[in-house]
Interface confidence: medium
């Protein structure tokens, strides 16, 4: 028996359902009584879901997995993972045994988009050219960690005085806070781009300083 899975990682958004595709080619006369199907975590060998002895043995993994029982006889051994969490990320191996056996691994990549950045300025009044200001760009609840880029109004990258914090909450999602310290020109725009490297999603925030008032 030959097992086939997607070579590309499956990208799933947090809290959505994902399908890890796995298929085999049943011989003529194949019945489910002959099938032993096991899904497990590749690294730890932890059992995720199984079909043995002619029946679905159910989820061994937080009761969020399911097979496609009506499609098994056609050779579809795919696994449905519900309400995806950050901790589900990784490699899953599909083992199929009929008379002989084969296995293949599929990678699950978990992602969550970052919120539109909020921009804060310190100090935020009585600003003059030559003043040192701190601009903070904050974006929330993304995964994995973001790449953060700063640019001025002409699109020139600002890489100098930047510090970035990325902290995970109890669900494993990250909040990002990036701080740019800059000496003000006569007027200027400062833009922050928060990129999710898996989704290739860019979230933009900017602040324009033109004397008073400030524009966000």
């Amino acid at each position: 028996v030959e097992v086939q899975v997607s070579e590309d990682p499956v990208v799933a958004l947090v809290d959505t359902d994902a399908t890890l595709r796995c298929s085999f080619s049943p011989e003529p006369g194949f019945s489910l009584a002959q099938l032993n199907l096991i899904w497990q975590l590749t690294d730890t060998k932890q059992l995720v879901h199984s079909f043995t002895e002619g029946r679905d043995q159910g989820s061994a993994y937080s009761n969020r997995t399911a097979l496609f029982p009506d499609l098994l006889v056609q050779g579809n051994a795919s696994l449905r993972l519900q309400r995806v969490r950050v901790t589900d990320e990784g490699s899953y191996t599909c083992f199929v045994s009929i008379q002989d056996f084969d296995s293949a691994a599929v990678s699950l990549q978990v992602a969550a988009p970052y919120s539109k950045p909020s921009m804060t300025l310190e100090p935020n009044k009585d600003l003059r050219p030559g003043n040192m200001v701190t601009i903070t760009c904050s974006s929330y609840q993304g995964y994995p960690e973001a790449e953060v880029f700063w640019k001025d109004g002409q699109g020139v990258p600002l890489t100098g005085n930047v510090t970035t914090s990325q902290m995970a909450n109890e669900r494993g999602l990250f909040d990002v806070h990036s701080v740019l310290r800059v000496v003000l020109g006569a007027n200027g725009t400062y833009s922050c781009l928060v990129r999710n490297p898996v989704l290739q999603q860019d979230a933009h925030g900017s602040v324009t300083i033109t004397g008073q008032p400030l524009t966000f």
Partner: antibody, heavy 120, light 112 residues
């Protein structure tokens, strides 16, 4: 327990590019939640963070080295690599690869280190 | 960047006696999620650093319970209740709150 092993030349000439590879075993580089890192230690000195990469390609570099550093990943070989351009004697150090756990921001596994000397 | 200052830089200890290392941060390492992003590492002679304590006070897997981390905000302490010969090396604190991640300058523990 995941194992990390650094490899590459131990001697690099000034102005050239330092290239190192870290091979990960007993664990997949594609397992989520970990960030694959480079840290260096100048002779007899403390530790300096260089940068890290996520398996999907997102990179994060120390501002002081950002203009000279590239970190890349090859998930098919379970490896990640460091390139540092325009090296000088000040880049002579033991270079460590390490795994950073995203949830705690900690370097929980380290390679044995490789001494790279920059000299003509 | 965040600066971590360790003291003492050298610590001679008699086996069986306690030891204490201080790490002071230039800014608070407490984040709004309630976690404190301060780690401790030990680099034994000729070896790479090994992970001891994470998030301020949690022992890493396999670390003996004679090691404990404490502190909050900007002041942190690593305590060894009874020093053993195998504990010699350089101890580093590290902040994981903000890039660039930074380490203390190290405290060398040696046996008297």
């Amino acid at each position: 327990q995941v194992q990390l092993v650094e490899s590459g030349p131990g001697l690099v000439k000034p102005s050239q590019t330092l290239s190192l590879t870290c091979t990960v075993s007993d664990g997949s580089i594609s397992s989520g939640g970990y960030y694959w890192s480079w840290i260096r230690q100048h002779p007899g000195k403390g530790l300096e963070w260089i940068g890290y990469i996520y398996y999907s390609g997102g990179t994060y570099y120390s501002p002081s080295l950002k203009s000279r550093v590239t970190i890349s990943v090859d998930t098919s070989k379970n490896q990640f690599s460091l390139k540092l351009t325009s090296v000088t004697a000040a880049d002579t150090a033991v270079y460590y690869c390490a795994r950073r756990a995203g949830y705690s921001s900690s370097f929980d596994s380290w390679g044995q280190g490789i001494l790279v000397t920059v000299s003509s | 960047e965040i600066v971590l200052t360790q003291s003492p830089l050298s610590l001679p200890v008699t086996p069986g006696e306690p030891a204490s290392i201080s790490c002071r941060s230039s800014q608070s390492l407490l984040y709004s999620n309630g976690y404190t992003y301060l780690d401790w590492y030990l680099q034994k002679p000729g070896q790479s650093p090994q992970f001891l304590i994470y998030l301020g006070f949690n022992r890493a897997s396999g670390v003996p319970d004679r090691f404990s981390g404490s502190g909050s905000g900007t002041d942190f302490t690593l305590k060894i209740s009874r020093v053993e010969a195998e504990d010699v090396g350089v101890y580093y604190c590290m902040q994981g709150l903000q890039t660039p991640y930074t380490f203390g300058q190290g405290t060398k523990l040696e046996i008297k």
